[in-house]
């Protein structure tokens, strides 16, 4: 009886089970009762990453430098090229098809997490006792200066954007 289902890494065609082509190879011709499935290796800059019956290999992804992209991992006959972004840029999507400049955290905000090739800068508001007076993609919120430890007193209170201003203590006559 002709099969109705096939084993893993096989496919059903013309009432018989044929072997799938292994990753890195494409289908040239289906098997017969006399011959195995005929497969051919993918060409340069092509790949197939699964057991398959594809008649054409996929083209490796192109990491376009005009879009801020560079190669993170070169593709093989079994894997696609992995792109990432140039320094100071990050991917706009999981597929990393283009890049944008890392955002900077405005004054009053500090960097919670520095950007990577795939994620943007994460900013957080400076809490009480901390400040940031610059727009930066790297600077965290800094703690206000402790006037007391310098034997000084606060002359001007700090904000989320400015440090405290310390001054000498008034001497009692």
């Amino acid at each position: 009886e002709p099969p109705t289902a096939c084993r893993e890494k096989q496919y059903l065609i013309n009432s018989q089970c044929c072997s799938l082509c292994q990753p890195g190879q494409k289908l040239v011709s289906d098997c017969t009762e006399f011959t195995e499935t005929e497969c051919l290796p993918c060409g340069e800059s092509e790949f197939l990453d699964t057991w398959n019956r594809e008649t054409h290999c996929h083209q490796h992804k192109y990491c376009d430098p005009n879009l801020g992209l560079r190669v993170q991992q070169k593709g093989t006959s079994e894997t696609d090229t992995i792109c990432t972004c140039e320094e100071g840029w990050h991917c706009t999507s999981e597929a990393c098809e283009s890049c944008v400049l890392h955002r900077s955290c405005s004054p009053g905000f500090g960097v919670k997490q520095i950007a990577t090739g795939v994620s943007d800068t994460i900013c957080e508001p400076c809490p009480v006792g901390f400040f940031s007076n610059v727009s930066s993609a790297f600077e965290k919120c800094h703690p206000w200066t402790s006037c007391e430890t310098k034997d000084l007193v606060v002359q001007q209170a700090g904000t989320n954007k400015t440090d405290v201003v310390c001054g000498p203590q008034d001497r009692l006559r």
């Epitope: 040239v28 011709s29 098997c31 017969t32 009762e33 006399f34 011959t35 195995e36 005929e38």
Partner: antibody, heavy 117, light 107 residues
Framework: EVQLVESGGGLVKPGGSLRLSCAAS????????ISWVRQAPGKGLEWVAS????????YYPDNVKGRFTISRDNAKNSLYLQMNSLRAEDTAVYYC??????????WGQGTLVTVSS | EIVLTQSPATLSLSPGERATLSCRAS??????LHWYQQKPGQAPRLLIY???QSISGIPARFSGSGSGTDFTLTISSLEPEDFAVYYC?????????FGGGTKVEIK
């Protein structure tokens, strides 16, 4: 017991025709592809033709394509090879062989075809 | 067409010796290769299929190995009845092709 018995061989003049038969028994003939393989005197094995179990697909090497025709009658458990425009180089023992697991797992004893003037 | 080259053409050995027969394909054929034995005046007999799979009823002294382009048939200890011609056959693509054969003869 699986058995394949060839017949129809003989002496034929160049340009002539011959029809070989292969009678099968001991297995469900209609479930198997069958091939013809030949062997010239003192030489190696050479594939000649194959036919799928249902008879809908046939395969030939270039040197016999257009001259030889493989066919089968599943109701009669029989395989045939019609050979036309025969040449001296077609002289050989012709075997029919069953295809099991894509291998020629059972063979007949062969029939001799001699093409000579 | 895939060309199969068998070597040596003739192998002269004594009973009890180990026989190593080679079959080389002109292009990669994965494990899509069979081995046959033929004795004088007889039809060929299937010995090994898919390069290394043993056949029921074939003595365990016959074994096959290899994949890609290089294949080997080994007879671990020759018996008198093993002196014959051995053929490899590829079924990776059309046309089906056989090697030229290796004759194993008594030394």
């Amino acid at each position: 017991e699986v058995q394949l018995v060839e017949s129809g061989g003989g002496l034929v003049k160049p340009g002539g025709s011959l029809r070989l038969s292969c009678a099968a028994s001991g297995f469900t003939f209609s479930n198997y592809g069958i091939s013809w393989v030949r062997q010239a005197p003192g030489k190696g094995l050479e594939w000649v033709a194959s036919i799928s179990s249902g008879g809908d697909n046939t395969y030939y090497p270039d040197n016999v394509k257009g001259r030889f025709t493989i066919s089968r009658d599943n109701a009669k458990n029989s395989l045939y090879l019609q050979m036309n425009s025969l040449r001296a180089e077609d002289t050989a023992v012709y075997y029919c062989a069953r295809a099991g697991e894509k291998a020629m797992d059972y063979w007949g004893q062969g029939t001799l075809v001699t093409v000579s003037s | 067409e895939i060309v199969l080259t068998q070597s040596p053409a003739t192998l002269s050995l004594s009973p009890g010796e180990r026989a190593t027969l080679s079959c080389r394909a002109s292009q990669t054929i994965n494990n899509n290769l069979h081995w046959y034995q033929q004795k004088p005046g007889q039809a060929p007999r299937l010995l090994i299929y898919y390069a290394s799979q043993s056949i029921s009823g074939i003595p365990a002294r016959f074994s096959g190995s290899g994949s890609g382009t290089d294949f080997t048939l080994t007879i671990s200890s020759l018996e008198p009845e093993d002196f014959a011609v051995y053929y490899c056959q590829q079924f990776s693509s059309w046309p089906l092709t056989f090697g030229g054969g290796t004759k194993v003869e008594i030394k």
